[in-house]
């Protein structure tokens, strides 16, 4: 069998949801000594980076300016050390937002409920879309989908204090082109004192784990680079729609 290098890790810096005309940054974390990185889009080569000097850093950032629906979709990356290519990374779904219109998000019976009550979110958008998405801030990888002509409902079932937080919804024109976000709706779930004090606190920043962890090489890193890279690939779980 043909020998290949370990697959790189692809990440979106800050967020995979990029407002139209803004810049997306995708990181491909490969290996020290890589002479070329390739970014692939929907299975075709999109862009090439050749680090200078190659041996000093374990990855590259691909900046995608002027985000639009033609640049939204599934990305992956590969890298090369000498003549040896890596396996392909996992797929990353890059979404363009702020397309067309703004939906309205509401919650029933209301934004303040007690633990155990059944809660339903409603997302409404009058323009032509059939898929709606509900995201909890700080948890934007956990996208809930629902379908409807102008409105979709998101039944949450009996809620707990873990459901507390700020929610937004989007209308989706296809898997990778979303509307402007709705205004946030803050859900407050009151429960008994023990539950409340133990409730997890959401981070206030989105996708805090999606930062580009590119490092410059040191002697120790050089020795551990391959082992470390393999370990990261093993533990990294990536988002798929």
């Amino acid at each position: 069998p043909k020998q290949t290098l370990p697959k790189p890790i692809i990440r979106a810096e800050s967020t995979y949801m990029v407002p139209k005309e803004k810049q997306a940054t995708l990181c491909c974390q490969g290996s020290y000594g890589a002479v070329e990185y390739q970014l692939h889009f929907e299975g075709s080569l999109f862009a090439v980076e050749r680090p200078k000097p190659p041996e000093r850093i374990n990855g590259v950032k691909f900046h995608i300016p002027d985000m639009n629906s033609r640049k939204a979709g599934r990305y992956s990356c590969i890298y090369r050390v000498g003549e040896l290519w890596s396996e392909r990374s996992d797929l990353l779904d890059l979404v363009v937002t702020e397309m067309y219109d703004t939906p309205t998000l509401s919650v029933h019976p209301g934004p303040e409920v007690t633990s155990g009550e059944k809660v339903t979110f409603y997302c409404r958008l009058d323009t032509a879309t059939s898929m709606f998405l509900l995201l909890k801030e700080g948890r934007s990888r956990d996208v809930q989908r629902s379908y409807g002509k102008v409105q979709a409902e998101f039944p949450m079932g009996p809620v707990t204090t873990a459901h507390r937080g700020s929610y937004r919804c989007f209308g989706s024109y296809n898997n990778y082109a979303w509307s402007f976000p709705s205004e946030p709706v803050k859900l407050l779930v009151t429960g008994d004192i023990e539950n409340t004090s133990l409730a997890p606190t959401d981070p206030t920043f989105p996708d805090s784990w999606d930062t580009c962890l590119l490092t410059r090489e040191t002697g120790l890193q050089k020795d551990l680079a391959l082992w470390d890279h393999t370990a990261q690939n093993h533990h990294h779980h990536h988002h798929h729609h």
């Epitope: 810049q23 999109f46 862009a47 090439v48 980076e49 200078k52 900046h63 300016p65 002027d66 033609r70």
Partner: nanobody, 127 residues
Framework: QVQLVESGGGLVQAGGSLRLSCAAS????????MGWFRQAPGKERDFVAA????????YYADSVKGRFTISRVNAKNTVYLQMNSVNPGDTAVYYC????????????????????WGQGTQVTVSS
């Protein structure tokens, strides 16, 4: 806004050479990665060659590697495609494209990465 105008196309014999030029009007030419694509009748538009905004690196389709050379002169707002050892398979309309990049070492290969396109220049290779 960038306007692109290709020139230099024409009829050439197999084995001959041709140099295409693409003149850009508008500001900040040196911030744009540039590429050449071609489209033969009834076929899709194919990538030919690309160059980063700084001029290095460059990237070529396998079918033209070693025969074609892409270059740019930022002071003249112009990108060139030097075509050597042409063959009938190189017959097509050649398009120049410009795409903004945030790094001067990025080469853009996919057509969706380009925002601006020229009208094209016809290249015909006779055998």
């Amino acid at each position: 806004q960038v306007q692109l105008v290709e020139s230099g196309g024409g009829l050439v014999q197999a084995g001959g050479s041709l140099r295409l030029s693409c003149a850009a009007s508008g500001r900040s030419f040196s911030r744009y990665a540039m590429g050449w694509f071609r489209q033969a009748p009834g076929k899709e538009r194919d990538f030919v060659a690309a160059i980063s905004s700084s001029g290095d690196p460059t990237y070529y389709a396998d079918s033209v590697k070693g025969r074609f050379t892409i270059s740019r002169v930022n002071a003249k707002n112009t990108v060139y495609l030097q075509m050597n050892s042409v063959n009938p398979g190189d017959t097509a309309v050649y398009y120049c494209a410009a795409g903004l990049t945030a790094r001067d070492t990025t080469v853009v290969v996919h057509p969706n990465g380009y925002s601006y396109w020229g009208q094209g220049t016809q290249v015909t290779v006779s055998s």
